[in-house]
Amino acid sequence: ASCREVCCPVGPSGLRCTRAGSLDTLRGLRGAGNLTELYVENQQHLQRLEFEDLQGLGELRSLTIVKSGLRFVAPDAFRFTPRLSHLNLSSNALESLSWKTVQGLSLQDLTLSGNPLHCSCALFWLQRWEQEGLCGVHTQTLHDSGPGDQFLPLGHNTSCGVPTVKIQMPNDSVEVGDDVFLQCQVEGLALQQADWILTELEGAATVKKFGDLPSLGLILVNVTSDLNKKNVTCWAENDVGRAEVSVQVSVSFPASVHLGLAVEQHHWCIPFSVDGQPAPSLRWLFNGSVLNETSFIFTQFLESALTNETMRHGCLRLNQPTHVNNGNYTLLAANPYGQAAASVMAAFMDNPFEFNPEDPIPVSFSPVDGNSTSRDPVEKKDETPFG
């Protein structure tokens, strides 16, 4: 049976609205919840597309609004349609389209042909997309003070760029308890908004923000060592796009060190943790003397999944240690703000050459085939992978 409604279903999850002049909004489309495809045509009264219009269309993957009266698409129009991958807005009355409109979408196809698009910095992102062949952009006509059949380049004197963002930081070293003043300087045309992103700072400092474009100020009050390795970000937006810059405030504090008991892993490991800012230099002592690192005994840092902390963990790695490696291991850590040391006794194996007359004398019988090897106490058969 033919459909006489304004919008008719197409397949299990499509909707086609083509009866001329019957829609001025897309709000409240019936059965829109599981819609994946929406096709709108010949709707001269449909002039604006706002984010409320597509609310509830979370599954939408393809949107076509063609040969209609669309003049304005809100920057957040597609906030509720994150899966949108095909967008065709050809043959409407669009003069511009904000970069924010498509931000966050994984568009495979964007068609804007047949619109009186005005060549300005606000469309620089679109020009770049087309030049780079991104996601099948089709524009065909972009007007620069007059109609034309191709995407006209912006004039040579026109400088379209995202804002330039710089953060000024203190030159002096920052210590625990200090107040730190940061300033974000923004330059650029048609600046719209700017702000700080401080999500990583919770608990590391009290924050006070002040000022507005083009200069934003930030005071971090009573900083702690937890502030280290945390990003402080300033962002700014204009017609062309968004820019952001991140810095990390380095808060100095003395070296500290912790040693654990030797554990037998793939090789032997004397585990340690060191902290301090700047990162402390490390030195090992063995029985009070400097221990020079070699391929048999060396420091190996563990690659931490946490890149936002100053503490480093690692091992003094001992490859197949013998009785000569038994003794007292000390780790010295030092930075300009202090030094620390920790020691641990390690016994890897007994001295096989110490003979006690009262010990029983071991007797071993070789197998008949004679294919035997003498085994040293330290050996762990085939435990170390070759090369």
Partner: antibody, heavy 117, light 109 residues
């Protein structure tokens, strides 16, 4: 699998310097020591020294300190030895080997250096 | 610097057991010297056979074994095969450096 690929043969003038490369694949370059070994006919094998790429720790055989310089580029997983002030005594085949003590590791195929005027 | 001494040449027959030894000029070879045995075949093809006195890496045939015999390190090939004809180097660790022996040329006739 672990592989060490060395650069090609070099013909050098006395007094010049040469840099030999050892490109590694199949393991985490920064975590294992690279050994350098010299082989000369009639002189057997001589250990030049070792480097731990991830931390830049270097141990030289005292006999080659000043003659050999070890470096490593962790971005390309490549170890290098530079031999300076070359003389005929430096004509030899030079090997790199990845060591995993107590094993003396996987070896490269060697780079022949000939010093001749 | 220590000197490591090996037999210059040995000859054996297929199926026989042969033992190569390695002496240190500083005294008895101990487990702290981590004796290694490396095989060299033509065209500079080196393969590690034994590490840490008596550890055999994966892939090395079981006929190769390492041990300490008296004050020397030893490599024993039980049931030698023709493809075992090669030069065998002993390598010893002295606290912070390796020293190679002069190598033993093994002929399997």
């Amino acid at each position: 699998q672990v592989q060490l690929q060395q650069s090609g043969a070099e013909l050098m003038k006395p007094g010049a310097s040469v840099k030999i490369s050892c490109k590694t694949t199949g393991y985490r370059f920064s975590s294992y020591w690279i050994e350098w070994v010299k082989q000369r006919p009639g002189h057997g094998l001589e250990w030049l020294g070792e480097i731990l790429p991830g931390r830049g720790i270097i141990n030289y055989n005292e006999n080659f300190r000043g003659k050999a310089t070890f470096t490593a580029d962790t971005s390309s997983n490549t170890a290098y030895v530079q031999l300076s002030s070359l003389t005929s005594e430096d004509s030899a085949v030079y090997f790199c080997a990845r060591t995993d003590p107590p094993y003396f590791g996987v070896w490269g195929a060697g780079t022949t250096v000939t010093v001749s005027s | 610097q220590a000197v490591v001494t090996q037999e210059s040449a040995l000859t054996t027959s297929p199926g026989e057991t042969v033992t190569l030894t390695c002496r240190s000029s500083t005294g008895a070879v101990t487990i702290s010297n981590y004796a290694n045995w490396v095989q060299e075949k033509p065209d500079h093809l080196f393969t590690g056979l034994i590490g840490g006195t008596n550890n055999r890496p994966p892939g090395v045939p079981a006929r190769f074994s390492g041990s300490l015999i008296g004050d020397k390190a030893a490599l024993t090939i039980t049931g030698a095969q023709t493809e075992d004809e090669a030069i065998y180097f002993c390598v010893l660790w002295y606290s912070n450096h390796w020293v190679f022996g002069g190598g033993t040329k093994l002929t399997v006739l």
